[in-house]
């Protein structure tokens, strides 16, 4: 029998210092975790430890804090670098800076290889991307050899901004004849390291004929055996055991999000490469896990650049961004049409000709806009305001939703109007009115939303049966200030960008700004 | 500066085994593997295996599988490579190379010439 | 094991010619290939890796393209210090395997 070990994670998203428990700024810290230096600390003492011993990680590095903003990539093949992965897979975010914003930062700069079997370049990209990522790539793993196969979610068009010249195939289609290559190469141990989430990880398992283990990422799913160690919940075993279509236990595994675990799977094959046992857990990288000094004082030495950009400015407004609870929880306020704006814009991809645009709808609870921007400072909005704004570094992310469920969720929006409570939702894409006269939970009497499939945007009443995507906090989309029914019903489900980060593009972008309070939320008295 | 700094040309009658050396400086030994290669006279080049100095696994080619061992001092940043049961045909020089990260052969020793005659 | 096949094996050209070497592999390598100069009497050189990614401090006339199973080495204008032998390698998968390589002479 021989044992190897795979450290993993997943969606780190430029969380490249420590965070604190919820993977937010570190404010304390002798309670703070993860940050790529105790990562090291951790790798380092158990590639020591151990003989054989792989560290993967399944996508989604970029996009997340202003690391990425300031450094578009360049911190994520510098450190990652550094602590000598083995191998990446593609995320989505990988491609928010487009094609280009991945080739020169990470994939000419890494030292390990990026991968994915189900991207494929076509037309004048095929030859510049050529050889920079691979389907597969086989390692030496002690006396053995390893196949690591890579996938990405196929949905990343939608998603982020990988232009026309690649193709995402279905992950299981694209990986079954890389597999099935590699295996006439005698290559009889087999990872398949991706990023499309738990649902297609387990799917992979159970239908790639080949398949040893699968590592995985996207969902940002928690398993854990025994009594997890911080907040997050488990979603199932780890790892996870799928019985594959022709009989074999396959182990799943993912690290949940953000750096804040290592994931540590062992597994034992037979000389002919069968899996005879898995076992492991994520490792919680708390404080008791010192940060290495190297790689520390590296960061020390990258972050200067930080500090100068967070004053830097990034555009002008030339009205009054009102973010003050006064407004935003009571009313439409510019500065939540202002953030609503910016979701959109960022989510602009023109996909289908039948479409104009995949999503044209956007909430956005009233209680996450904590500050307002006076314009009377010369117009100058910078990235320091605006974290005064958005404070949380939480993320816009886009979700399925039927038109049942958001008229529950404005119901709630207005279940308790008048107490200063943060559920009010403003919009984009989207006219309400309330009749405040009415019972809670039958105040929304005229719920409007912005055509998809047209050519010339309008608004419609919204169809209870019919299925709308929209853009949200992730915070509403995990159920906060009390929007269950978003957490229940939800269809579907893709982690997006930072929000400060998706504010701050849309006004370099537009350089003037000039929101204004224009009727998206309205208030009647009586029939209507 | 990378250097990858072989011992000296052997003569070995047939039968007889032969160890090289390759002593390694101007990087961290165990972040890179150390592949070997022969070059036969006027032939062209032939990967013989490869070794992990970090934790000693080694890969072989199966041609050489039984009479190659490939072994490394991580104290004094050197890999060897033993050849047994030596037939003229083994008459080579024989090289170390140090991979980068993508397993591509960075660097070069110098070649030990290895003839083996009776 | 994957067979890699030079071609010419060798050829004559001047300097300041455009001298093009192809390799096949009797698979697809994955863009897994490298190309190596040997001069007579020393250890090989490498030139390039991942197929086209030129190692610091090779003269940019130096270049490499294809995917899947076809290989090609380009100097753009040959200089003095080139002519040599190169091979191309295969390292996608064990066992590695080089080309029986070419041969640059001058003409």
């Known amino acids: 029998a021989w044992e190897l070990t795979i450290l993993h994670t997943n969606d780190v998203h430029s969380r490249l210092e420590q965070t604190s428990e919820d993977s937010s700024k570190c404010v304390n810290a002798s309670r703070c975790m993860g940050g790529v230096a105790r990562l090291f600390t951790k790798v380092q003492q158990i590639r020591r430890a151990e003989p054989n011993v792989l560290l993967l990680d399944a996508g989604d590095q970029y996009q997340g804090t202003i690391w990425f903003t300031v450094y578009k990539g360049a911190e994520v093949a510098h450190f990652m670098n550094a602590l000598r992965y083995d191998a990446m897979a593609l995320g989505n975010h990988e491609f928010d800076n487009g094609v280009e914003g991945l080739i020169e930062p990470l994939l000419k700069e890494a030292k390990f290889p990026i991968l994915s079997a189900n991207i494929k370049a076509k037309g004048p990209l095929a030859s510049q991307i050529s050889g920079l990522y691979l389907p597969y790539k086989v390692l030496p793993v002690g006396d053995e050899v390893v196949g690591i196969v890579g996938y990405t979610s196929k949905e990343t068009p939608f998603l982020s901004n990988p232009g026309t010249n690649l193709v995402f195939e279905d992950e299981i289609t694209a990986l079954q004849p890389e597999v099935d290559k590699l295996k006439t190469l005698n290559v009889n141990k087999i990872i398949a390291l991706g990023h499309s989430g738990f649902e297609m990880d387990k799917l992979i398992a159970q239908k790639v004929r080949g398949v040893d283990v699968v590592v995985g990422g996207h969902s940002n799913t928690f398993l854990y055996t025994g009594n997890p160690p911080s907040k997050e919940v488990p979603a199932g075993k780890y790892p996870f055991i799928v019985t594959s279509d022709d009989g074999r236990k396959v182990p799943v595994v993912q690290a949940y999000a953000f750096g804040k675990y290592l994931g540590y799977l062992k597994i034992e094959f037979d000389e002919r490469g069968n899996v005879i046992s898995s076992h492991g857990n994520p490792i919680l990288l708390n404080s008791s896990i010192p940060e290495d000094p190297s790689i520390k004082a590296d960061i020390n030495k990258w972050r200067i650049k930080l500090d100068n950009y967070s004053t830097q400015e990034l555009g002008k407004t030339i009205v009054y961004l009102d973010g003050s609870s006064q407004s935003c929880r009571f009313r439409e306020c510019n500065m939540g049409n202002l953030i609503c704006d910016a979701m959109i814009n960022n989510n602009l991809r023109h996909t289908d000709e039948m479409f104009w645009n995949h999503v044209s709808m956007c909430i956005l609870n009233g209680g996450g806009i904590r500050s307002p921007i006076d314009e009377r400072n010369n117009g100058t909005i910078t990235w320091e305001n605006l974290a005064a704004v958005l404070p949380f570094g939480g993320t816009f992310d886009l979700v399925q939703l039927k038109g049942s469920t958001l008229k529950k969720a404005f119901e709630h929006s207005v279940h308790r109007y008048g107490q200063s409570t943060g559920e009010f939702l403003q919009v984009g894409g989207i006219h309400v009115v309330y009749d405040l006269s009415r019972k809670p939970g039958d105040r929304v009497v005229k719920l409007d939303v912005l055509c998809t499939k047209c050519r010339v945007p309008s608004y419609d009443p919204l169809k209870m049966d019919e299925v709308y995507k929209v853009i949200l906090p992730n915070f509403l989309a995990n159920g906060g200030d009390g929007f269950q029914m978003i957490k229940d019903e939800l269809l579907r489900h893709d982690s997006g960008d930072q929000d400060i980060n998706v504010v701050s593009t849309y006004i370099s972008k537009m350089k003037v700004i000039y929101p204004a309070v224009e009727g998206r939320i309205k208030f009647s008295t009586g029939s209507h | 500066e990378v250097q990858l700094v072989e011992s000296g040309a052997e003569v070995k009658k047939p039968g007889a085994s032969v160890k090289v050396s390759c002593k390694a400086s101007?990087?961290?030994?165990?972040?890179?593997?150390m592949d070997w290669v022969r070059q036969a006279p006027g032939q062209g080049l032939e990967w013989m295996g490869d070794i992990n100095p970090n934790n000693g696994g080694t890969i072989y080619n199966q041609k050489f599988k039984g009479r190659v061992t490939m072994t490394r001092d991580t104290s004094i940043n050197t890999a060897y490579m033993e050849l047994s049961r030596l037939r003229s045909d083994d008459t080579a020089v024989y090289y170390c190379?140090?991979?980068?990260?993508?397993?591509?052969?960075?660097?070069w020793g110098q070649g030990t010439t290895v003839t083996v005659s009776s | 094991d994957i067979v890699m096949t030079q071609s010419p094996s060798s050829l004559s050209a001047s300097v300041g010619d455009r001298v093009t070497i192809t390799c096949k592999a009797s698979q697809d390598i994955n863009s897994q290939l490298s190309w190596y100069q040997q001069k007579p009497g020393k250890a090989p050189k490498l030139l390039i890796y991942r197929a086209n990614r030129l190692i610091d401090g090779v003269p940019s006339r130096f270049s490499g393209s294809g995917s899947g199973t076809d290989f090609t080495l380009t100097i753009s204008s040959l200089q003095p210090e080139d002519f040599a032998t190169y091979y191309c390698q295969q390292y996608d998968v064990f066992p590695r395997t080089f080309g029986q390589g070419t041969k640059v002479e001058i003409k």
């Open positions: 101007g990087y961290t030994f165990t972040d890179s593997n």
């Open positions: 190379a140090m991979t980068n990260w993508d397993y591509a052969m960075d660097y």
